[in-house]
């Protein structure tokens, strides 16, 4: 047990001890999106408000033009919720010529873009087709999961039609990350 | 390198350091709900298994009274999952006079009381039309995001009807919250 | 205050400190399925990538066998989405003889064995009743929470039909769990 | 009840600027977006943008961007859109509207402020 | 770039029903918060009718009704009466989020 005695409760630690109350963290909040034009095939990202009202961000976690910016390498855990709205789907007319229509649907996904790498890297989606009967219809995806993150790299949320994303409430629709 | 010998790995810590088993956590779950009086235009709040089968409160984190107690400022990951069930939505008699009805819905909201603030706060929501066709039905809403909290604020559990809450098993509905 | 000299910043701590960075950690990702025998009353497990793509097990937290092994003890985030798709549900017939019909539904269940207790114990459970109208469909369920675990505890996800998992792509279905 | 009331009619020469003011009350200021939308003379209605006068957050149609400048003072509880570079097709009654914030339909309209831009 | 089409103008003796028409050049016209109607009398600001395809705003009479069908949205004015002359605008969102305005039109009551 030689020199263990300057030791003290912490002999098990190979990495660097860092207090959690510094580590980079972020809680994005909706905000309105401004009108802007953008590829048909290419999923429109979301902006965010990122110091008004729940929002924050903190330890060198910066949000700029759509995206979170990863100050630090590690595994961090990252999450949103995009709540969705919308008039009543055409697929409610249920069948046409006896067969099902393709139907109408939802997504988000958050992701990765890393400088270095020429194409982005979707982390997470959540999908769901919708096809509503008779009347307006809401709903939220989540999504949430820890992934190995790279100082540089940069988050992002895209959907499926930026049309449809409730904006009304900061509580609806979010996005957040933090380190591990 | 002068009077590094003395910090050995965790040089760079300006907050206090502390033990990641030593933090306020909680996770509680779905008990049979007790007929109360709530107010038309205000949903009804939970309450929680604290102690048996998965439920837990540690460190400080205590439970009381439909309410989880903050002990500690800090930042939080606070979630929740609520299963509804119910019968066959009016919404599914599809159209009256050609128009659609007002969507049937389901809400869970994640909400923030502090004592020396007036009005609640709502963290999180999660909302759905239910406008099922044919059948019982019964699905889950999940919530979860890491909020700034302060010592004393009180975390409850808010749903749009108590009724279609599902309180059959402690896995189906459940709420909980952890200091980062 | 004797001795205090040599405790500089972190004295409040009574459990050992331990560097975040090593604890362990897993995120793994869908893959194709293969044909498996289960017996009819019970939902069969999922097995997963664990080393390719997103996916990663690191710092003890080993996979095998459809399982996650928890290599020590203490308080464990646990995640899962699943993605199901599948054809229009029978359910869609809306009634027969004037009664709903029993209905379709998608189920996931994160379980926990313990090789010391007969029965498995179900932590988390996300349900729904599927009754779709007049297409495909498509759908994620996501489930979160903090649960206490002992070393050796095996985590596995069930879910009520395999044949609905959506296995094309690793951001939408995936499974994970992290020490915090 | 809610009311917009906006500020009288201006005159502006080609290449001005001329900035309208929208005065709420009846509401709470800060919890609706405010639209723009102008009408010239014997023509149909014009969306011009929309301001968010809690967080100062905006969003312009693309014809305006670079032209139109969308403020709120939440002091007093009242919107601004000032119009650059003005020319003679700008002359139209410009009007505000308050959303309702589910369907962001235009609910509470004011009375109109008619900007004529001729040399 | 989306387009709201409007008939430029529809008439109809007192009590009785028109329909004014509004049609998307494409499909997405008004998935997230629907279609809406605004009636202006000469000299006023417009007065919102109708939100949300079928809604009517509390104060505005029940003769005057919603409808959607596929890309195209109506509204239908019942028992028309002398004061319900004036310009009609149909209005929606496209998938940019601009706020679009149908060109208008023009409803006179004969007689």
């Known amino acids: 047990l030689k020199g263990q005695e300057f030791a003290p409760s912490h002999q098990q630690v190979y990495a660097p001890l860092r207090a959690d109350g510094d580590k980079p963290r972020a809680h994005l909040t909706v905000v309105r999106q401004t009108p802007t034009q953008h590829f048909k095939n290419q999923f429109p990202a979301l902006h965010w408000e990122h110091e008004l009202g729940l929002a924050f961000t903190k330890n060198r976690m910066n949000y700029t033009n759509k995206f979170l910016l990863i100050p630090e390498s590690g595994d961090y855990f990252i999450y949103s919720q995009v709540t969705f709205r919308g008039m009543t789907s055409e697929c409610s007319e249920i069948r046409q010529a006896g067969r099902p229509n393709k139907p109408d649907s939802i997504t988000v996904v958050i992701t990765k873009v890393t400088d270095s790498y020429p194409e982005p890297t979707q982390l997470l989606m959540g999908t769901k087709s919708v096809c509503e009967v008779g009347s307006n219809w809401f709903q939220p995806i989540y999504l949430g999961a820890m992934f190995s993150l790279q100082e540089g790299d940069k988050l992002m949320v895209n959907v499926s039609d930026i049309s449809l994303v409730d904006y009304t409430k900061e509580d609806k629709t979010f996005f957040g990350a933090f380190l591990l | 390198l002068k009077g590094q010998e003395f910090a050995p790995s965790h040089q760079q810590v300006y907050a206090p350091l502390r033990a990641d088993g030593d933090k306020p956590r909680a996770h509680l779950t779905v008990v049979r709900q007790t007929p109360t009086q709530h107010f038309k235009n205000q949903f009804p709040a939970l309450h929680w298994e604290h102690e048996l089968g998965l439920a837990f409160t540690k460190n400080r984190m205590n439970y009381t009274n439909k309410f989880l107690l903050i002990p500690e400022s800090g930042d939080y990951f606070i979630y929740s999952q609520v299963t509804f069930r119910g019968m066959t939505s009016e919404c599914s008699e599809i159209r009256q006079a050609g128009r659609p009805n007002k969507p049937d819905s389901i809400t869970v909201v994640i909400t923030k009381v502090t004592d020396s603030y007036p009005e609640p706060t709502q963290l999180l929501m999660g909302t759905k039309s239910v406008c099922e066709v044919g059948s019982n039905w019964f699905q889950p809403i999940y919530l979860g995001a890491m909020f700034s909290l302060q010592e004393g604020d009180k975390l409850m559990v808010n749903v749009s009807d108590i009724s279609l809450v599902d309180y059959t098993k402690e896995d189906k509905t459940f709420f909980g919250a952890f200091l980062l | 205050l004797k001795g205090q000299e040599f405790a500089p910043s972190h004295q409040q701590v009574y459990a050992p400190l331990r560097a975040d960075g090593d604890k362990p950690r897993a995120h793994l990702t869908v893959v194709r399925q293969t044909p498996t025998q289960h017996f009819k009353n019970q939902f069969p497990a999922l097995h997963w990538e664990h080393e390719l793509g997103l996916a990663f097990t690191k710092n003890r937290m080993n996979y095998t066998n459809k399982f996650l092994l928890i290599p020590e003890s203490g308080d464990y985030f646990i995640y899962s989405q699943v993605t199901f798709r599948g054809m229009t549900s029978e359910c869609s017939e809306i009634r027969q003889a004037g009664r709903p019909n029993k209905p379709d539904s998608i189920t996931v269940v994160i379980t926990k064995v313990t090789d010391s207790y007969p029965e498995p114990t179900q932590l988390l459970m996300g349900t729904k009743s599927v009754c779709e109208v007049g297409s495909n469909w498509f759908q994620p369920i996501y489930l979160g929470a903090m649960f206490s675990l002992q070393e050796g505890d095996k985590l596995m996800v069930n879910v009520s039909d395999i044949s609905l998992v959506d296995y094309t792509k690793e951001d939408k279905t995936f499974f994970g769990a992290f020490l915090l | 009840q809610v009311q917009l009331v906006q500020s009288g009619a201006e005159v502006k020469k080609p290449g001005a600027s001329v900035k309208v003011s929208c005065k709420a009350s009846g509401y709470t200021f800060t919890s609706y977006d405010i639209n723009w939308v102008r009408q010239a003379p014997g023509q149909g209605l014009e969306w011009m943008g929309w301001?968010?006068?809690?967080?100062?957050?905006?969003g312009y149609a693309q014809k305006f961007q670079g032209r139109v400048t969308m403020t709120a003072d939440r002091s007093t509880s009242t919107a601004y859109m000032e119009l650059s570079s003005l020319r003679s097709e700008d002359t139209a009654v410009y009007y505000c509207a308050r959303e309702v914030p589910e369907t962001a339909a235009f609910e509470y309209w004011g009375q109109g402020t008619l900007v004529t831009v001729s040399s | 770039q989306s387009v709201l089409t409007q008939p430029p103008s529809v008439s109809g003796a007192p009590g009785q029903r028109v329909t004014i028409s509004c049609t998307s050049s494409s499909s997405d016209i008004g998935a997230g918060q629907g279609v809406h109607w605004y009636q202006q009398l000469p000299g006023t600001a417009p007065k919102l009718l109708i939100e949300?395809?079928?809604n009517r705003p509390s104060g505005v009479p029940d003769r005057f009704s919603g409808s959607k069908s596929g890309t195209s949205a109506s509204l239908t004015i019942t028992g028309l009466l002398p004061e319900d002359e004036g310009d009609y605008y149909c209005?929606?969102?496209?998938?940019?989020?601009?706020?679009?305005f149908g060109g208008g039109t023009k409803l006179t009551v004969l007689g």
């Open positions: 209005q929606s969102y496209d998938g940019t989020l601009s706020a679009l």
């Open positions: 301001l968010n006068p809690n967080s100062g957050n905006t």
């Open positions: 949300g395809y079928y």
